[in-house]
Amino acid sequence: SPVPFGPEGRLEDKLHKPKATQTEVKPSVRFNLRTSKDPEHEGCYLSVGHSQPLEDCSFNMTAKTFFIIHGWTMSGIFENWLHKLVSALHTREKDANVVVVDWLPLAHQLYTDAVNNTRVVGHSIARMLDWLQEKDDFSLGNVHLIGYSLGAHVAGYAGNFVKGTVGRITGLDPAGPMFEGADIHKRLSPDDADFVDVLHTYTRSFGLSIGIQMPVGHIDIYPNGGDFQPGCGLNDVLGSIAYGTITEVVKCEHERAVHLFVDSLVNQDKPSFAFQCTDSNRFKKGICLSCRKNRCNSIGYNAKKMRNKRNSKMYLKTRAGMPFRVYHYQMKIHVFSYKNMGEIEPTFYVTLYGTNADSQTLPLEIVERIEQNATNTFLVYTEEDLGDLLKIQLTWEGASQSWYNLWKEFRSYLSQPRNPGRELNIRRIRVKSGETQRKLTFCTEDPENTSISPGRELWFRKCRDGWRMKNETSPTVELP
């Protein structure tokens, strides 16, 4: 079976000891209060039973307190994401206490040993929180633990061991190896805090999944399906890194959870919304863009507290970089007849025209197949805010772009050489905006011309009934 490798380190064929020769290792956890936005500042070290540093370093007992918990490390140094997150928290919550949990000596080990150390580190954090609770005005409800990778499970242990209930735990792509399918007391779980929200960015159903696939929080958000993150493909990575490798892809996708969270802190005017759905395929079909009954939520720091009886899996698409927000649209296309479709699925593209901007040409992903005499649902998303939609251009691509489709066309031709022209009839397209929850119906410009065939296009304009609002709540979220 595949062996775990380093979420925050180098991709290795096998586990091995870090390059350090270990002498005089203290099994230690340090708590560094980041007292300045300057990342070079050494900060203040807090220790249980010593009240002086709390006073010297102006620890604010009534403010929010964030604990940032790193994960496994091959290098023994703090990864660069940590400083970004510290800075973003300081920017967003000026009075808050930001504490970095430094467990590098225990994380700079074999992955399996680091996993075994998570419990010890969780205990240390719980002890610190228990001690802080003895102080006047300090409230556990104001504590927000933010754990990346292995650090997410450390946060889970801390929440489990502390006397009382921590306000919130955010798991940023919690580690998968040795935690997938584990008992709830041996991993991050919803009972570890009053609110547990999780971002999954590197899950794989084949091979080794660096991030945990299973839902482990009250809400589990899977950006881009939780696996392939835009801007993290080998081509993207090779573009920015001369000697880019699969390792860089792993790091990019795994770390994307941190950047999504940072984005939610610094770009609060551009919140990204996720939508509840049973699985990624259904989301890709555009079925799940509802905000009724708490079915949508802001992601990252701005997430609304939801304590569902059942775990809530949520999905969204994102851009390749900050700000990550995109605008989701559900497109319902009723195909009322088609001719000579043969074996191959058509390749459709849409262009959306709005009051603010026009979209690029967007592909309609056919998840299964086009059904006739049925409503086919698609998900499209744009990087820019188009405003109110005015018209839609639907294009059926002519020449096949894939070898598979070419082969199917060739087979179709062999079995039916005089295959008359393929044709599809569409009268209207219903569009729903995920972000505004508004619904609109578009009709063909010419009611007599509803047919579309390969290499042709069909134009749709807003039908006379205009915008239809269906008593649905907009995903606008009160910011914390």
Epitope: A20, T21, Q22, T23, E24, V25, K26, S28, R30, N32, R34, D38, P39, E40, H41, E42, G43, Y45, S75, G76, I77, F78, N80, L82, H83, K84, V86, V100, D102, L104, P105, H108, S240, I241, A242, Y243, G244, H259
Partner: antibody, heavy 120, light 111 residues
């Protein structure tokens, strides 16, 4: 003020060992990592590795595994570099330099350097 | 490991003139908006001294005649105007990941 004071020059024979010290003052020793940098005569700067002054965990660069050992005595805020089985090519100035655990980890404070000469 | 290539290897400048040294990295040393590129000055018989950190920030006590710029893989150290006591070797360094690496150095001489 913040400073790193290194031990004096050493003249050693091939095969011998040497231990260079670096004493920190003016700051909390365990709050910064301690790096070792080698500069051979007329050459550039070469990072040898570093030691986490809190945990005592050393990390060695590829060319410095084996004969080189980093150690600490936190009670006297001192880091040590020991080189065993000295060779002529170990002749160089050895610098200790401080870097933060946080931020961009540049080397903001340097010792004056210890010249180690290996000659028969 | 990231390789840093400095140019020119040596440079002779008259006092009052501008000296420009470049450093090219084999891969990007940027993380988000931060550049993990730094510059050091080493005078004969002395240890290196931090001049510029994070591509463009002047280290404490360094005169404003020194400035740094660049991002990604291409960085520049500028001394303007050059003074007689600027005779030294200048090194760039990256710390985006371990091992931190140094450029080969540029020897600046004052005419």
């Amino acid at each position: 003020q913040v400073q790193l004071v290194q031990s004096g020059s050493e003249l050693k024979k091939p095969g011998a060992s040497v231990k260079v010290s670096c004493k920190a003052s003016g700051y909390t020793f365990t709050n910064y990592g301690l790096n070792w940098v080698r500069q051979a005569p007329g050459q550039g700067l070469e990072w040898m590795g570093w030691i986490n002054t809190y945990s005592g965990v050393p990390t060695y660069a590829g060319d410095f595994k084996g004969r080189f050992v980093f150690s600490l005595d936190t009670s006297v805020s001192t880091a040590y570099l020991q080189i065993s089985s000295l060779k002529a090519e170990d002749t160089a100035v050895y610098y200790c330099a401080r870097r933060g655990y946080y931020g961009r980890r540049f080397f903001d404070v340097w010792g004056k350097g210890t010249t180690v000469t290996v000659s028969s | 490991d990231i390789v840093l290539t400095q140019s020119p290897a040596s440079l002779a400048v008259s006092p009052g003139q501008r000296a420009t040294i470049t450093c090219k990295a084999s891969q990007s040393v940027d993380y988000d908006v931060d550049s993990y590129m730094h510059w050091y000055q080493q005078k004969p018989g002395q240890p290196p001294k931090l001049l510029i950190y994070a591509a463009s920030n002047l280290a404490s006590g360094v005169p404003a005649r020194f400035s740094g710029s660049g991002s990604g893989t291409d960085f520049t150290l500028t001394i303007n105007p050059v003074e007689a006591n600027d005779t030294a070797n200048y090194y760039c360094q990256n710390t985006i990941e371990d091992p931190p690496t140094f450029g080969g150095g540029t020897k600046v001489e004052i005419k």
